[in-house]
């Protein structure tokens, strides 16, 4: 058994997350992964849940109870998405550290936008010919 | 010229995010890009990436005079980076959105954590023992 | 003070099995992940294994993968490193090595602290 | 095979600046940290960089580190360079999971 099963159940214990009424009104995360078996696809959705999981153990992290599950599901996290490694970790969290309310923040994301749009689109690297190909098409000339 | 670019650069004057200072102190999302060459991990961080420009584009809705300019982005997001897929969108959708302090979403989000660990790691469909090889060795027994 | 005292070294016979220890202070032991690095006489430095913090995964070195085994014990603040089927190349200063905390962000860095090393000298 | 590679020696004049690289043969340089570490006959290894380009609490400023992506490359530049300096340096990183790899190790010379 994977570490992080005993210390989820001792969080699920901490949060009443075992009662039956938990259940109600479908799953937060686990029917969209259903949804997505590419990889690429699941981790844009991992991306997300896994933020979602960080931000909550921050808000409980002085909480002594369960300091040491927490520890440890994060390890596990870091080890299995992150692969060990720190600095897909330390970018990831710089990400998703940025407040969209900084002005400062707000013009560099805005003078970005160009470059970080060019990228979007896995056939970005392979030139433009290939990627209007990909889109099954070209535009339109404007 | 990508149907973005005007879009963008009318959000640049509007932000004023030409000036030269914008630059000082490094990039938010450009160093990072560059850092990823795989394409799962340019997804893990592009996920949070527009998730942080879907948000900024909410703050700004109702300014008419860059509407037009955010709507054109957003669907040019949507064609590249969710390639035209509502479904995906919509499900990513749903993730940005969940509220960590809301007491119901982190009780569903605990009782559902040891599934989406499993689900974490790319080996993880492939059982345990290949997921063991993956981490080069198996845990040692607590 | 982070300390990392290395202990069981020897001399053995090719073919023959050991198991080194390493006792750490100074830290909260099971938060840290641990390396076990090598180094031939006159020769570079070459890693060994690692073992994770609280959740005990290994991870080995492709070429020392079947014969090593790294485990640990959170409770005595111990990692061990047990070595079989000895050969000669395996004559080296085996250090144990500080790893990251993966599970907090602001981590101190990785291989930081480093032991004085055992010396294994595996010889007929 | 991953590998990094370094120059097997440098040397220079004291007061002078030394750089040794460190190349990464598959893999992108930037997708990992790079540490770089100092040996001294008969001790452990300590470490004169960390995460790329940070410094540990007691290294001098004459030590940086930074990397190239466009070469593949990471490097540490001595500058000032003294005859306490004269050691091993050996750069380190990672590959797959938590995969620990070193170099071979540049001997550095102080001359004069």
């Known amino acids: 058994q994977d570490p992080y099963v005993k210390e989820a159940e001792n969080l699920k214990k901490y949060f009443n997350a075992g009662d039956p009424d938990v259940a109600d009104n479908g799953t937060l995360f686990l029917d969209i992964l259903r949804n997505w078996k590419e990889e690429s696809d699941r981790k844009i959705m991992q991306s997300q849940i896994v933020s979602f999981y960080f931000k909550l153990f921050k808000n409980f992290k002085d909480d002594q109870r369960i300091q040491k599950s927490v520890e440890t599901i994060k390890e596990d996290i870091n080890v299995k998405f992150f692969n060990s490694n720190k600095k897909k970790r330390d970018d990831f969290e710089k990400l998703t550290n940025y407040s969209v309310t900084d002005s400062n923040v707000q013009r560099k994301a805005v003078h970005e936008l160009i470059q970080v749009m060019a990228e979007l689109s896995p056939a970005a690297k392979i030139g433009k010919r290939k990627r209007s190909q990909m889109f099954r098409g070209r535009r339109a000339s404007q | 010229q990508d149907p973005y670019v005007k879009e963008a650069e009318n959000l640049k004057k509007y932000f004023n995010a030409g000036d030269p200072d914008v630059a000082d102190n490094g990039t938010l999302f450009l160093d990072i890009l560059r850092n990823w060459k795989e394409e799962s991990d340019r997804k893990i961080m592009q996920s949070q990436i527009v998730s942080f420009y879907f948000k900024l584009f909410k703050n700004f809705k109702d300014d008419q005079r860059i509407q037009k300019s955010v709507e054109t982005i957003k669907e040019d997001i949507n064609v590249k980076f969710f390639n035209s897929n509502k479904k995906k969108r919509d499900d990513f959708e749903k993730l940005t959105n969940y509220s960590v302090t809301d007491s119901n979403v982190q009780r569903k989000a605990v009782h559902e954590l040891i599934q989406v660990m499993a689900e974490l790691s790319p080996a993880a469909k492939i059982g345990k023992r290949k997921r063991s090889q993956m981490f080069r060795g198996r845990r040692a027994s607590q | 003070e982070v300390q990392l005292v290395e202990s069981g070294g020897g001399l053995v016979k090719p073919g023959d099995s050991l198991t080194v220890s390493c006792v750490a202070s100074?830290?909260?032991?099971?938060?840290?992940?641990i390396h076990w690095v090598r180094q031939a006489p006159g020769k570079g430095l070459e890693w060994v294994a690692t073992?994770?913090?609280?959740?005990?995964?290994?991870f080995y070195s492709d070429s020392l993968r079947g014969r090593f085994t790294v485990s640990r014990d959170n409770a005595q603040n111990s990692v061990y490193l047990h070595m079989s089927s000895l050969r000669g190349e395996d004559t080296a200063l085996y250090y144990c090595v500080r790893g990251y905390d993966h599970s907090d962000s602001n981590s101190a860095a990785d291989l930081l602290h480093w032991g004085r090393g055992t010396l294994v000298t595996v010889s007929s | 095979n991953f590998m990094l590679t370094q120059p097997l020696s440098v040397s220079g004049y004291p007061g002078k600046t030394i750089v040794i690289s460190c190349v990464r043969s598959?893999?992108?340089?930037?997708?990992?940290?790079v540490q770089w570490f100092q040996q001294r006959p008969g001790s452990a290894p300590a470490m004169v960089i960390y995460e790329d380009s940070h410094r540990p609490s007691g290294i001098p400023d004459r030590f940086s580190g930074s990397v190239d992506a466009s070469s593949n490359s990471a490097s540490l530049t001595i500058s000032g360079l003294k005859t306490e300096d004269e050691a091993d340096y050996f750069c380190q990183s990672y590959y797959g999971n938590n995969q620990v790899l070193f170099g071979g190790g540049t001997k550095l010379t102080v001359l004069g």
């Open positions: 100074g830290f909260t032991f099971s938060n840290y992940f």
């Open positions: 598959s893999g992108s340089v930037a997708s990992h940290y």
């Open positions: 073992i994770s913090g609280r959740t005990k995964y290994m």
